[in-house]
């Protein structure tokens, strides 16, 4: 038993050109959260498999407004971490697939848009018990600045979680805060025991009694924001409380590449350069090959066999990243003009156009109904980008032009039969219905639940619709 | 594919209850977002309450705000929309629509992909 937590410390524009300023589209104000899921990391599954290993869904972020004077975005987070609750055994190697929602906060027709406005997927492998492994991932236009780790929960210890750890009664040969763990007297396990009061948000541990700090905390347990803003796409005064990644005095003090990776100092942050076999922003990821299935959604891994070859993905169209992981965000270019609404189809492009507006790109600026006509007794209705008719009984089409079969969405309740008429339809209900549409059921004793019969009309009688 | 078969639909008095079920199988979990929508004789189809799936989030339409609830047992894999206070402006097929889209307007039926054939509820005064 164990669980599994994610720390967002920061999503906004990626560096270079025609990063979008704002994660709100021109409707309004909006504001973001995290869906993380977990699956089994070396079975081949399809993108949209369950998520066998769990998920987590974060607290909506506050309401974010793009300022036009603005310099730069400075995105709210959701507070507080992700947690993935596991009961069983840690797998080690995983699927972490994190998605960034929007929910579009303005009053539209037909109600709250939400739209997926990223994702990433990283296959890793992950023990139990470890420090914090830290990640930035690109989907499209946007960069996620992360980190997670795996810890075991209750008496499991292990990196995978499965041993139970009983406390003895006996002195411990162990030293000071570690325990032995049955059966085996002469091991002793460091159950995860920071400095009391070290941040859980923002502290770990890897020896008892210490409070190592994340990126951007600083002080004995992990609590001070570091003072240095230098957010690294995201400026402004609540950076701090947002999490957002703060380089400390030195990245790479402490050496936080793994696996005898060496570490550079970058624009504040770092790059590990891994010995040969060993992936990942810290080198974290050893010996990845075609072998473990590395390439998502239908990729082509190309790659030796021998377990220090890296691999190459061939991604399928639509999908890129180094494990095709990302799908292409056509979306991302902002293709709909005057605010619509983008859905990406996979195979098309189509935009949801405002009231007003029409075209593939919403590029047509319309007054709705100024000139149009609806024959027949049609009357034009505003909204939905084009002017649009409410038909008479009888017809439909763009203008009212076409004559409709009144009985083909079966208006005609409980059995009733439709027979079209020159002023609309007609039901034959069925013994026991009355009424226009047959709705209303009839008592045995012939009086209806509901008003009586018209004059001359009797329960069960065809009955026309006017 | 997602398949929605609907139930629960009937006649009842004005003020009364009904309980709308609607059971999904197949790829369910590709499912993002939920919802039930209805159409009146010679009306549009329109939404009335949508659920997304994985967030518990929910979304309704002024008209039945209030009196409509709509919840999910996902181990069931079923949807329902709990209908308090009908009147006889509810009278419609209902319809139970599921979308696996990443962008979805949560009242808007033609952004929802697969539908059931719909359960009818008549209110009468």
């Known amino acids: 038993a164990g669980v599994f937590e994610l720390q967002i410390h920061s999503f906004g524009p990626g560096p270079g050109p025609g990063a979008p300023r704002s994660p709100c589209s021109a409707r309004g104000p909006c504001r973001l959260f995290f869906r993380v899921c977990l699956k089994p990391g070396l079975s081949e599954e399809a993108a949209e498999s369950p998520c066998a290993l769990g998920a987590a869904l974060s607290a909506r972020g506050p309401v974010y407004t793009e300022q036009p004077e603005a310099p730069a975005p400075d995105l709210p987070l959701p507070n507080g971490l992700l947690q993935v609750p596991f009961r069983d055994a840690w797998p080690g190697t995983f699927s972490l697939i994190i998605e960034t929602w929007r929910e579009e906060l303005g009053d539209q027709i037909g109600g709250p848009a939400w739209s997926l406005l990223a994702r990433v997927t990283r296959r890793r492998r992950l023990a139990a018990g470890g420090p914090w492994a830290r990640d930035i991932q690109r989907a499209g236009a946007w960069e996620l600045r992360f980190s997670y780790r795996a810890r075991c929960e209750l008496l499991a210890v292990g990196t995978a979680c499965t041993r139970l750890c009983r406390p003895r009664s006996a002195p411990s040969r162990c030293g000071p805060g570690l325990r032995p763990c049955a059966p085996l007297e002469d091991e002793c396990e460091a159950p995860p025991v920071c400095r009391a009061g070290c941040s859980l948000e923002h502290g770990f541990c890897e020896q008892p009694g210490e409070c190592r700090c994340l990126e951007g905390w600083t002080g004995p347990l992990c609590t001070v924001p570091a003072s240095t803003s230098s957010c690294l796409g995201l400026r402004g005064p609540s950076s701090a409380t947002t999490g957002c990644l703060v380089p400390g005095p030195g990245p790479c003090d402490g050496n936080p590449c793994a696996n005898g990776g060496s570490c550079s100092e970058t624009p504040g942050s770092f790059e590990c350069t891994c010995p040969r076999g060993f992936y990942g922003l810290r080198c974290e990821v050893s010996g990845v090959t075609c072998a473990d299935g590395p390439c998502f959604n239908g990729g082509l891994c190309v790659g030796g066999a021998d377990p220090d070859s890296a691999y190459i993905c061939h991604c399928p169209p639509g999908f890129q990243g180094s494990n095709c992981e990302k799908r292409v965000d056509r979306c991302s270019l902002q293709p709909c003009r005057n605010g619509g609404l983008c859905l990406d189809l996979g195979h098309a492009l189509r935009c949801r156009c405002r009231a007003g507006f029409a075209g593939p790109r919403c590029e047509h600026n319309l007054d709705d109904c100024a000139g149009r006509a609806c024959a027949n007794g049609g009357t034009c209705v505003e909204g939905g980008g084009a002017h649009r008719c409410s038909c008479a009984l009888g017809f439909g089409g763009r203008d009212c032009r076409e004559r409709a079969d009144p009985c083909a969405a079966r208006p005609c309740a409980h059995g009733g039969r439709c027979y079209a008429h020159f002023s609309g339809l007609v039901c034959a209900c069925a013994p026991g219905y009355m009424g226009s549409r047959c709705e209303f059921p009839v008592h045995p004793d012939g009086v209806s639940a509901l008003p009586a019969a018209p004059p001359g009309l009797r329960p069960g009688d065809p009955q026309r619709y006017l | 594919q997602v398949r929605l078969v609907e139930s629960g639909g009937g006649s009842v008095q004005a003020g009364g209850s009904l309980r709308l079920s609607c059971a999904a199988s197949g790829s369910t979990y590709s499912t993002n977002f939920m919802g039930w929508f209805r159409q009146a004789p010679g009306k549009e189809r329109e939404g009335v309450a949508t659920?997304?799936?994985?967030?518990?989030?929910?979304a309704y339409a002024d008209s039945v705000k209030g009196r409509f609830t709509i919840s999910q047992d996902r181990a069931k894999n079923t949807v329902y929309l709990q209908m308090n206070g009908l009147k006889p402006e509810d009278t419609a097929m209902y319809y139970c629509?599921?979308?696996?889209?990443?962008?979805?307007?949560?009242?808007?039926?033609?952004?929802?992909?697969?539908w059931g054939q719909g359960t009818q509820v008549t209110v009468s005064s």
């Open positions: 629509a599921a979308a696996a889209s990443t962008a979805v307007r949560l009242l808007d039926p033609g952004d929802f992909a697969y």
């Open positions: 659920l997304v799936t994985w967030a518990e989030r929910t």
